[in-house]
């Protein structure tokens, strides 16, 4: 048994890092590997985790840490029962993928302005809190060529469009994912999407 | 120069409890109490994260010592709780910038655990 693709982790930088590898043939990852982790800090103990199939020879872990600071250093050891497969180290900081953002509400009822919020996925005392821009992505279900990108740069988690930009009459979909320019993370997933009814009054026109 | 002063050290009786406290001159990733009991080797007691929520124990002291900071007076506390004979040593504050925590060392407060 050899690990084919070395462990890769990436960091939510909060409570939770995901490490995937893949093994050089089928593999029931939970039954036959442990990957133990262990921060680099004085009197901290080993955890270990029980991966789970991610494809066939492909394995994901997904590390329970109580919080996560800048200086954090992982070590990493992948076990097939006594026998090790891999040594590593991880330091999230330098791995961040921001959790998703949540709670994607579109306001139709001012006037002709579309208001989409969202709710920001850390808790205020987390450093990610004050520093996620987000991207909001808006489509239209009826046209595949109406696709259209927003970027949020700064740091109140909503949107204020004029829905007149949009199509009159037809159903949108929205969806909104986060990356820290700080740590320059990878962008989060994306949030689950929600739909609405674009209307809104023509203006009238004087001939 | 960083500086570390410890306090509260003393004489207490078996069960008793005691309060050390050391100030530190900045701030720091790791921040931890060792102990050296005669004629023994130094051996970490407690250690803190930055941000002040990830705590560490030795087996010896689990339960009974608690370590805290205060991270706007970048002080550390170490309440000591059940004190027993064997807790008997003189106690360090140490810092560090890596999880090492052995950069800087305090002058030492001396604990005795005696009826």
């Known amino acids: 048994m050899k690990v084919l693709q070395e462990p890769t982790c990436v960091s939510d930088y909060m409570s939770i890092s995901t490490c995937e590898w893949k093994m050089n043939g089928p593999t029931n990852c939970s039954t036959e590997l442990r990957l133990l982790y262990q921060l680099v800090f004085l009197l901290s103990e080993a955890h270990t985790c029980i991966p789970e199939n991610n494809g066939g020879a492909g394995c994901v872990c997904h590390l329970l840490m109580d919080d996560v600071v800048s200086a954090d250093n992982y070590t990493l050891d992948l076990w097939a029962g006594q026998q090790l497969l891999w040594k590593g180290s991880f330091k999230p900081s330098e791995h961040v993928k921001p959790r998703a953002p949540g709670n994607l509400t579109v306001h139709t009822n001012v006037s002709d302005t579309l208001l989409l919020t969202w709710s920001n996925p850390y808790p205020p005392d987390n450093y990610l809190y004050n520093h996620l821009t987000y991207a909001v992505n808006i489509w239209s279900e009826n046209d595949p060529a109406d696709f259209r990108i927003y970027n949020v740069t700064y740091l109140e988690p909503s949107l204020r469009i004029a829905a007149s930009t949009l199509k009159s009459g037809i159903s949108y979909r929205a969806r909104v994912r986060a990356w820290a320019q700080c740590y320059n993370t990878t962008w989060s997933e994306w949030s689950p999407s929600t739909k609405w009814h674009n209307s809104y009054r023509e203006p009238f026109e004087q001939h | 120069q960083v500086q570390l002063v410890e306090s509260g050290g003393g004489l207490v009786q078996p069960g008793g409890s005691l309060r050390l406290s050391c100030a530190a001159s900045?701030?720091?990733?790791?921040m931890a109490w060792f102990r050296q009991a005669p004629g023994k080797e130094r051996e970490a007691v407690a250690a803190?994260?930055?941000?002040?929520?990830?705590?560490y124990y030795a087996d010896s002291v689990k339960g009974r010592f608690t370590i805290s900071r205060d991270n706007s007076k970048n002080t550390l506390y170490l309440q000591m709780n059940s004190l027993k004979a064997e807790d008997t040593a003189v106690y360090y504050c140490?810092?560090?910038?890596?999880?090492?925590?052995?950069?800087?060392w305090g002058q030492g407060t001396l604990v005795t655990v005696s009826s």
């Open positions: 803190i994260r930055s941000g002040g929520r990830s705590t």
């Open positions: 140490a810092v560090g910038v890596d999880g090492n925590c052995r950069n800087y």
């Open positions: 900045g701030d720091f990733y790791c």
